[in-house]
């Protein structure tokens, strides 16, 4: 059974996750040249499912196409370069779905935008945040 | 009403040079990238590249790089195509079009240049 | 140079289905976009990021997309629909490009 230090942990490296996402979300949407509106010409694969800590296996393989587009934003509205913005989102994945655990990501039929892809991890890292509360 | 309105038909020699216009209303216009696209008779769509009037950041299609200039004042809402030689070839029918959602959603009704030689 | 491949020409009767494809390499990871062009017209879009309807687009008209391949399906074909259609993408580079168009004959 989970310890609270582990719980503790856990909330912690998704509270992480989360400001990290959200850090892309705003560097995006306060786009003046919306250069935003070429970034959305990017498709996102979706999760069938999003329930567990083992689905970020899901967001993983997604990170280095999200890589790709985030440099199109010349990085000027984020804090760290690309490379090291999912670097740092890279570790807390692992961490969080464990690297020992093989589990095979289901994909959803439907494609998303680089804003509906990041909203929907956004709200998964919400939605595990207070159940651990 | 949203839309574009382009400058109309122009008939010119080969060697001539030439600015076609294309202004924009109902909406923000400096917020918008605006995009050209040629058609030449009987043929299909080429995308020849693309603005954004704020600043009058360009992107270029490789195969229209050097053969033709996008500008833009935002003052009054217009962007321009302009070449500064014009050939044969280039006879075609050029759309400006609206870049909103990724997708080119409002189109100008076309200016159609002849180029005789 | 990135391309969109498409087929020269489709032909159905009124009432059938059409199906018109596009194929390129980037299209697993870029949305595509579909436009309808009338004889002596400007071009409309009619499916924006793959499947994706703007208002006033018949319901008749839907996109799907399958790894390299999308494709834009009309239903209930209808004798307006005859036209020319193309699909547009962005290569890697973010450089846009068209298909060359496939020419709907409405029999």
């Known amino acids: 059974a989970p310890t609270s230090s582990s719980t503790k942990k856990t909330q912690l490296q998704l509270e992480h996750l989360l400001l990290d996402l959200q850090m892309i979300l705003n560097g995006i949407n306060n786009y003046k040249n919306p250069k935003l509106t070429r970034m959305l010409t990017f498709k996102f694969y979706m999760p069938k499912k999003a329930t567990e800590l083992k689905h970020l296996q899901c967001l993983e393989e997604e990170l280095k196409p999200l890589e790709e587009v985030l440099n199109l934003a010349q990085s000027k509205n984020f804090h760290l370069r690309p490379r090291d913005l999912i670097s740092n989102i890279n570790v807390i994945v692992l961490e969080l779905k464990g690297s020992e655990t093989t589990f095979m990501c289901e994909y959803a039929d439907e494609t998303a935008t680089i804003v509906e892809f990041l909203n929907r991890w956004i709200t998964f890292c919400q939605s595990i945040i207070s159940t651990l509360t | 009403e949203v839309q574009l309105v382009q400058s109309g038909t122009e008939v010119k020699k080969a060697g001539d040079s030439l600015k076609i216009s294309c202004k924009g209303s109902?909406?923000?216009?400096?917020?918008?990238?605006i995009g050209w696209v040629r058609q030449m008779p009987g043929r299909g769509l080429e995308w020849m590249g693309t603005?954004?009037?704020?600043?009058?950041?360009?992107r270029y299609s490789p195969s229209f790089q050097g053969q033709v200039t996008m500008s833009a004042d935002k003052s009054i809402s217009t962007a321009y195509l302009q070449w500064g030689s014009l050939r044969a070839s280039d006879t075609a029918m050029y759309y400006c079009?609206?870049?909103?959602?990724?997708?080119?959603?409002?189109w100008g009704q076309g200016t159609m240049v002849t180029v005789s030689s | 140079s990135y391309e969109l491949t498409q087929p020269p020409s489709v032909s159905v009767s009124p009432g059938q289905t059409a199906r018109i494809t596009c194929s390129g390499d980037a299209l697993p990871r870029k949305f595509a976009y579909w436009y309808q062009q009338k004889s002596g017209q400007a071009p409309v879009l009619v499916i924006y990021?793959?499947?994706k309807r703007p208002s006033g687009i018949p319901e008749r008209f839907s996109g799907s997309s399958s790894g390299t391949t999308v494709t834009l399906t009309i239903s209930d074909v209808q004798a307006e629909d005859d036209a020319d259609y193309y699909c547009q993408s962005a290569d890697r580079s973010d450089s846009y490009v068209f298909g060359a168009g496939t020419k709907l004959t409405v029999l």
């Open positions: 079009a609206r870049f909103s959602s990724s997708a080119y959603d409002i």
């Open positions: 603005i954004y009037p704020a600043d009058s950041d360009t």
């Open positions: 109902g909406y923000n216009f400096d917020t918008y990238w």
């Open positions: 990021q793959d499947t």
